[in-house]
Interface confidence: low
């Protein structure tokens, strides 16, 4: 249990409040982490509060400015770059966003050895994505979808590709799936190790159907915004890898990486790409039917210039009951003889877990066991391999950084961070320097964050990094509430489940009940991290108890749990909070008739069908932004998980999953539909099907659009949407304003 | 429509220079490498270096390494081959050829220019 | 430098008949041969590139075929307008070559 102190003493009663709305909206109460810019194995750069970028230096403990902040305004520069040679930087301004990780800004080269900005060749703008090689100072650039390449910031560039085109084909950048759903980033080139080789992915959209939507914008007529988005059965991108040589480009141009051919034969994703060495790299690839993928490493062959790929060197990994890895599938972290790796993957009993592969995937090494789950490898040195999992008392919501020295046999582990700091921290992430000399560790809660500096040898604590002091003081006569986070046992099933519970909480006191669920596949949402938020002021102010449940589908407690929704969306996950209801109504403090369920995206997907469950539970909810039909959403995400809509697949289940063949059982409940017109990612096609199939039923329900918003309903939007979801639960658990 | 054309021919006297232009129409000049390429009477076809309009990076073949030069002007389209120190056996008629530049396998000189005729008599 | 052997030299064919020119390179080239075509007077025309890919605008009774260092141009039936010379090219390295060029005429 954790318990977060409400500091309620008699004598200070008086002078300490509870959570207001407005603390929330105007994130009153937010903190900070401290991730250092590793340049080497001792130095980091560090953006300081007065904006001047600095150079800390460990071992020497000096510090000095390397581009003062009058530089950094001259050109309105909110992020920098530092080339490996320490001569140039690239600043970046006019930051305009475009999906969840893709923005396009406009880049200037400061020439850190005559104070000057870099004149002539200048970078055009705006640049779609741009980075300095790993040594030196070359530099890789997307524009207009075209990929070009700058031997130095001064000269001319080199195109490297031709045949970019907007919404058609992507050189060095994903489109729109691929950025959400395979990659995760707004690149798809990488450079090696040395910078002798940049490997890049081209995506064909051409044949994809186009999403079209609204903007309004202030214009007389709309914009129309068109995205090549493949929904669940459609076309899909076509994807090929190439490389070119960036120290002779010109002389046989990039080459073609040849794709594995059990994976060619049928439609396949790219899903990522590994430097292991400047000659040799690893892709990863994955069948449209997301059980199989092939890790293929290939090498250049100086003789042809090209790249080999042999059979030898492919990695089989499959999945024989769910999809292949977890939310995606691991990627390999090589060791220092450059051919064997680690990864993660199920082992035997369905726990996801550190395996050394030397040949084959059939003889692999299981390097971690038991019934927990190893989450991220951090780093391979050439004695130690640290990584982060949730073994530690047996809290899968839980984080904590590992060390196994590889280096002598038998291989020891030991947890780094388990008991530095045990009641505030147990929720960890960690960053390193080259060769894992020092490393920085930053802690997400339960308590206060702190990011702190280790030795990389010996684990010493150097200093601490940031500790949010002004949060800590700014708490201080805040009612803050009681979190606690404990299981059900349930059929067999573990759910965990955390409660946020109002300050002066009474067990013996009735209490309204609201659920926040998002209940994804492989999500997460019973974390032991800190947090004040909307659900911290409505249990603060309001008087709310607020519970979030990790149920079937969740992740970090095994396959079983995990794939328990293969096929099924919408069906467990929905069970489960329901399940928790009953079972947090039988704890005696929780009032039956004021119980609400709100959830955003998957969430307001499970949130619309529980409120339609017919289970009479729930007297309201609200779904912001919800996925309201399988067919409605991207291939990529939607078939990992339901397979195909066709007959012969799973069309069935896509049919019965839907919101609207459940729009009658909304006539018992009170339902807030919310949803921005501009969302590019859960299209607003999915709330107006909703809202149609309401109609139809003569069903009565809420609704708020936000025009112009995305997924993420940000800005003024993100006020009103708050303030207005408050009305709504406080109208309906009869709380007066 | 796509094409090269080359200068006219011409006779030098041994050890003078000669500058053969050749200007592109029809396509995106710095799309393309430039070959150049020559062909003595009834011989063969030999290879002498490119240039990459984009950069104005150049590769000759080793033979014409220090007697060649290759420039190209992207504002008219057009690029030089210049030849130095001439000798009797560079009679020939001196082409240029475009290449792809982008993707695998170096495509092939699709596009040739006319050839220009190179007399060196004394 | 990479040299290129062609054979035969010169061969004599009538029209539709199935001629087959070979091309060696001294090492590996991959598949970074192209194949050419000359008429007297007039520039050549590149016809394969790749080893094996037609150029467009090429007949398709033109094929190429072979990687490494052994390649065969293919003309399936010789036309009037395929009298010609016939050269390799390897794009492999620097400097590029040709091969010697193979001479088809009427027999």
């Known amino acids: 249990i954790v318990l977060r102190p409400s500091r309620v003493h008699n004598s200070e009663e008086n002078t300490m409040r509870a959570l207001t709305l407005k603390d929330i909206l105007n994130g009153t109460f937010s903190y900070k982490t401290f991730f250092p810019n590793w340049i080497s194995g001792q130095e980091y750069l560090h953006q300081s509060a007065d904006n001047n970028i600095v150079l800390y230096n460990i071992e020497t403990g000096q510090s000095y400015t390397i581009l003062s902040n009058r530089t950094m305004k001259s050109v309105n520069a909110s992020n920098y770059g530092l080339s490996p040679d320490r001569q140039f930087v690239y600043l970046e301004s006019d930051y305009s966003k475009l999906w969840r990780y893709s923005y396009t800004a406009t880049y200037y080269i400061y020439d850190l050895s005559n104070g000057e900005f870099v004149r002539g060749n200048e970078l055009p703008r705006p640049i779609q994505y741009l980075c300095w090689s790993p040594v030196g100072s070359k530099l890789a650039y997307v524009y207009q979808n075209n990929i070009y390449l700058k031997q130095r910031p001064g000269d001319p560039p080199f195109q490297i590709t031709f045949n970019g085109r907007e919404n058609k084909i992507f050189n060095g950048i994903p489109d729109w799936v691929y950025e959400e759903e395979m990659l995760a980033t707004k690149y798809a080139l990488w450079w090696s190790p040395n910078g002798k080789f940049l490997a890049y992915a081209e995506f064909n959209d051409t044949d994809i159907p186009v999403i079209a939507y609204s903007y309004y914008g202030d214009e007389q007529y709309p914009r129309t915004i068109n995205i090549p988005y493949p929904k669940a059965g459609a076309k899909n991108p076509v994807v090929r890898i190439f490389i070119i040589d960036t120290t002779y480009p010109a002389y046989v141009g990039p080459q073609e990486v040849p794709v594995p051919a059990m994976i060619a034969s049928s439609d396949y994703y790219f899903s990522w790409l590994t430097w292991v060495t400047d000659e040799r790299v690893c892709l990863q690839w994955l069948k449209r039917v997301q059980n199989v993928s092939v890790l293929s490493i290939c090498d250049f062959r100086e003789d042809w210039q090209t790249w080999d790929c042999p059979k030898t060197q492919e990695h089989i990994e499959e999945s024989r009951t769910g999809w292949a890895g977890g939310f995606f599938v691991s990627t390999p972290v090589f060791s220092y003889d450059a051919i064997s790796y680690y990864k993660i993957f199920s082992d035997k009993d369905g726990y996801k877990h550190i395996h050394y592969i030397k040949d084959t995937v059939e003889n692999a090494i299981q390097i971690t066991s038991g019934k927990w789950e190893a989450i991220n490898i951090f780093r391979v040195t050439q004695d130690s391999l640290f990584y982060s999992s949730n073994e530690f008392e047996e809290y899968p919501g839980r984080r904590n950084i590992y060390r196994i020295s590889i280096g002598s046999y038998p291989p020891s582990k030991k947890c780094v961070t388990c008991h530095l700091r045990k009641e505030r921290c147990q929720y960890y992430t960690a960053s390193f320097s080259d060769y894992a000399k020092y490393y920085a560790l930053v802690c997400y809660g339960p308590g206060i964050p702190i990011s702190t500096l280790h030795d990389g040898r010996t684990d010493q604590e150097i200093k601490i990094l940031e500790e949010n002091k002004e949060l800590e003081n700014a708490l201080k006569n805040i009612q803050l509430p009681k979190e606690e986070i404990k299981k059900l046992e349930v059929d067999e099933i573990t759910l965990w489940y955390k409660m946020i519970l109002p300050p002066q909480f009474d067990r013996s006191k009735k209490y309204p009940l609201l659920i926040q669920v998002y209940g994804g596949p492989c999500s997460q949402s019973v974390r032991s991290v800190f947090a004040v938020n909307w659900i911290s002021y409505l249990a603060s102010k309001e008087g709310m108890v607020i519970a979030l449940v990790d149920g079937r589908g969740t992740a970090f407690q095994g396959d079983k749990l995990l794939y328990a929704v293969y096929r099924k969306l919408g069906v467990y996950e929905v069970e489960d909070q329901i399940t928790a209801v009953r079972k947090f109504i039988e704890m005696g403090f929780i009032d039956e008739k004021r119980i609400a369920i709100w959830g955003w995206s998957y969430g307001g997907y499970v949130s619309s069908l529980a409120l339609a469950s017919g289970t009479g539970l729930f007297k309201c909810g609200i779904a912001v932004a919800p996925v309201s039909s399988w067919e409605y959403y991207a291939s990529v995400y939607t078939e990992r998980f339901m397979g195909l809509p066709t007959k012969d697949d799973n069309l069935e289940h896509y049919k019965n999953s839907t919101v609207m063949a459940r729009a009658e059982y909304f006539r018992n409940v009170d339902y807030l539909l919310i949803h921005g017109t501009a969302d590019d990612n859960v299209h607003f096609q999915n709330s107006a099907q909703i809202a149609k199939a309401l109609v139809n039923a003569q069903v009565d329900f809420q609704a708020m659009w936000y025009s112009d918003q995305n997924h993420g309903l940000s800005g003024l939007s993100t006020n009103h949407l708050y303030t207005h979801m408050t009305h709504f639960l406080k109208q309906c658990f009869s709380l007066s304003d | 429509q796509v094409q090269l054309v080359q200068s006219g021919a011409e006779v030098k006297k041994p050890g003078a220079s000669v500058k053969v232009s050749c200007k592109a129409s029809g396509y995106t000049f710095t799309g393309y490498y430039m070959n150049w390429v020559r062909q003595a009477p009834g011989q063969g076809l030999e290879w002498m270096g490119w240039i990459n309009p984009q950069s104005g990076d150049v590769n000759f073949a080793q033979k014409f390494q220090g007697r060649v030069t290759m420039t190209r002007d992207t504002s008219i389209s057009t690029a030089y081959m210049e030849l130095s120190r001439l000798r009797s056996d560079d009679t020939a008629v001196y082409y240029c050829?475009?290449?792809?530049?982008?993707?695998?396998?170096?495509?092939?000189?699709?596009?040739w220019g006319q050839g220009t005729t190179v007399t060196v008599s004394s | 430098d990479i040299q290129m052997t062609q054979s035969p030299s010169s061969l004599s064919a009538s029209v539709g008949d199935r001629v087959t020119i070979t091309c060696r390179a001294s090492?590996?080239?991959?598949?970074?041969l192209n194949w050419y075509q000359q008429k007297p007077g007039k520039a050549p025309k590149l016809l394969i590139y790749a080893a094996s890919s037609l150029q467009s605008g090429v007949p398709s009774r033109f094929s190429g075929s072979g990687s490494g260092t052994d390649f065969t141009l293919t003309i399936s039936s010789l036309q009037p307008e395929d009298f010609a010379t016939y050269y390799c090219q390897q794009a492999n390295s620097f400097p590029f070559t040709f091969g010697p060029g193979t001479k088809v005429d009427i027999k």
């Open positions: 090492q590996n080239i991959g598949s970074y």
């Open positions: 050829a475009r290449q792809f530049r982008g993707y695998s396998y170096g495509y092939g000189m699709d596009v």
